[in-house]
């Protein structure tokens, strides 16, 4: 049976196709194509006659279109009307004519597509940003790419217009993109420029740093503060309350005690309308900020019960310290076997009781720190009794 | 690539008979018509006739009947033209051209020049 | 038969300059059912054979450089040569190939001035 067929079937638009033929029968006057899927004169593309071995054009032929000697027919430089059924009639010796009839689809190469935004500086979970990928094309397929990935499932993203428009829902800060949108037909594909989302934000809670709060008179205060936000928040610093300056860092030299307070960092965006304070407290000293860890030492760890005496010393090289004593939790002393000497350093027990044996520690502290030594272990023994059964040798 | 290849010049006395061959490559041979075309010294050019290379029909021009004979052998793709009772007059060159799809002659042999003279 | 009449007979032209050669056939060669001049252009080059330059009157064939151009009515026709090349040295011939028997014109020798 007398049948065609489209090389290719989808032709990109410029290019070429050809319309084979397969079975052609022997025997033959010449044949036709037509445009449509039937036979019609006044849509005769070209008529090919075995007799002259030549080809004339018909009504329908635009100059674009060859047929070849076995009946095939070449159609250069498509466009999409060219899109539809192509019918051939074959005129046989014995005047008995057969058909057969193709297709192919034209497409359009594509362009390179661009995105167009409503909202190119969104405000973070308030706005929605819907972007359209340009321009609308027929039987074109509409993808969507976020930092190279395609699309993750999220509520927040939603597809409309043929996959042609993206809208991003309560838009985040981490919704900045790129974004690329990619148009796809049958014969080609092309991906936009990337495209990123200016989302405003914040600012969130600012920060202060360093994160010190204690520092010796005469010592340099600089104090940094920053707030996420877009665009970046303009700060401005307050001290116990009254403003002192319109900057992100302040800096006092030559501190003394008087600039111990509460020192405010003040955050606004402008474009969110939007502020955020931090409150830190600097207190100025001459106390250590930080206490070092002391050391105990025991004179001996284990002793002989209601003989012995035993010292415990706590050291430390910090100045401007007091010292505290504990044993088992409580607070020392607690007897009046037990005296404390030297400011504090020095625990004397006399005598050891059994009562007395377990866990010592000490702590020393200012008004600002303090710190614990760690633990020590008294053990207390006593020496076995003479054997009294009331019996003299004998 | 199509080619059409003749073969080379003759000096033939009058009365005499002369075959030119014309060797076609690069295509399907009985696709596309053979036509033949003379130059007289000097003159321009002048249709003789074509030949089908499909159904071997001959097809000749008034004024090129008789004594030219229009062949094929599609075995080795080769068109003749056989001229015969050579003329002073049949002194010319003469050319083999393929008939194109739309009919021009879209591709040509190189010539054979026939020379008659006693 | 179909007379063609070609004109001039030969040409001078600078290099450079536009060659114009004219064909008008003794009736015409319009075919009304598609529209098609049935009217050919050859160039042919010191001892070579003739090479098709342009077919329907005004289509180039495959390969042949745009300053060569064609045009006409049913029965007067013109190719011309936007801008001579040393190449371009030739016989032209017009072919109507409307009716049996095909004919030529009798040529147009271009050279160079």
């Known amino acids: 049976q007398l049948t065609t067929e489209s090389m290719p079937f989808n032709v990109a638009e410029g290019k070429e196709v050809l319309l084979l033929v397969h079975n052609l029968p022997q025997q033959l006057f010449g044949y036709s194509w037509y445009k449509g899927e039937r036979v019609d004169g006044n849509r005769q593309i070209v008529g090919y006659a075995i007799g002259t071995q030549q080809a004339t054009p018909g009504p329908a032929n635009s100059g674009r279109e060859t047929i070849y000697p076995n009946a095939s027919l070449l159609i250069q430089n498509v466009t999409q009307n060219d899109t539809g059924f192509y019918t051939l009639q074959v005129i046989k010796s014995d005047l008995v004519n057969e058909e057969a009839t193709g297709q192919f689809h034209v497409y359009p190469e594509l362009p390179k597509p661009s995105i167009s935004s409503n909202n190119s500086n969104p405000v973070e979970d308030k706005d929605a940003v819907a972007f359209t990928c340009e321009p609308e094309t027929q039987d074109t397929t509409y993808l969507w790419w976020i930092n190279n990935q395609s699309l993750p499932v999220s509520p927040r993203l939603q597809l409309s217009n043929g996959n042609r428009t993206l809208t991003l829902l309560s838009v985040t800060r981490n919704d900045t993109g790129p974004y690329e949108c990619e148009i796809q037909n049958p014969v080609s594909a092309n991906r936009s420029d990337p495209v990123t989302l200016n989302v405003t934000y914040g600012p969130d809670t600012p920060t202060i740093s360093p994160s010190d709060t204690y520092y010796r008179p005469g010592a340099n205060l600089s104090l940094s503060c920053y707030a996420a936000s877009n665009p970046p928040a303009q700060y401005s610093w307050l001290i116990n309350g009254t403003f002192q300056q319109s900057t992100q860092e302040l800096f006092i030299p030559n501190i003394t005690v008087n600039n111990s307070g509460s020192y405010t960092c003040h955050a606004n965006n402008s474009v969110t309308g939007c502020n955020r304070t931090t409150v830190k407290t600097i207190i100025v000293t001459e106390l250590s900020p930080v206490v070092a860890k002391p050391q105990i030492k025991a004179s001996k760890t284990t002793v002989t019960g209601d003989k012995d005496s035993v010292n415990l010393t706590c050291s430390t090289n910090d100045t401007g310290i007091s010292i505290r004593w504990f044993f088992k939790n409580q607070s020392l002393p607690s007897s009046e076997r037990m005296k404390l000497s030297q400011g504090n350093t020095t625990l004397s027990i006399n005598p050891v009781k059994r009562e007395d044996a377990g866990t010592y520690w000490c702590e020393v502290f200012n008004p600002i720190s303090k710190n614990q030594s760690d633990p020590i272990m008294l053990n207390v023994n006593y020496n076995a009794l003479p054997q009294e059964n009331g019996l003299s040798p004998g | 690539q199509v080619q059409l290849v003749q073969s080379g010049s003759e000096l033939k006395k009058p009365g005499a008979s002369v075959k030119v061959s014309c060797k076609a490559s690069?295509?399907?041979?009985?696709?596309?018509?053979v036509n033949w075309v003379r130059q007289a010294p000097g003159q321009g050019l002048e249709w003789m006739g074509w030949i089908n290379t499909n159904t071997g029909n001959p097809t000749y021009v008034q004024g090129f009947t008789g004594r030219f004979v229009f062949s094929l052998d599609t075995s080795v793709t080769t068109a003749y033209l056989h001229i015969s009772s050579l003329k002073a007059e049949d002194t010319a060159v003469y050319f083999c051209a393929r008939k194109g799809i739309w009919g021009p002659f879209d591709h040509w042999g190189q010539g054979t020049l026939v020379t008659v003279s006693s | 038969d179909i007379v063609m009449t070609q004109s001039p007979d030969s040409l001078a032209v600078s290099l450079g300059e536009r060659a114009t050669i004219n064909c008008k056939s003794s009736?015409?060669?319009?075919?009304?059912?598609?529209?098609?001049?049935?009217l050919a252009w050859y160039q042919q080059r010191p001892g070579q054979p003739p090479k098709l330059l342009i077919y329907?009157?005004?289509t180039r064939e495959s390969g042949v450089p745009d300053r060569f151009s064609g045009s006409g009515s049913g029965t007067d026709f013109t190719l011309t040569i936007s801008s001579l090349q040393a190449e371009d040295v030739a016989v032209y011939y017009c072919?109507?190939?409307?009716?049996?028997?095909?004919?030529f014109g009798g040529g147009t020798k271009v050279e160079i001035k």
């Open positions: 072919q109507q190939y409307y009716s049996n028997p095909w004919t």
């Open positions: 009736q015409s060669v319009l075919y009304s059912s598609n529209n098609r001049l049935y």
């Open positions: 329907w009157a005004s």
């Open positions: 690069g295509y399907t041979f009985t696709n596309y018509g």
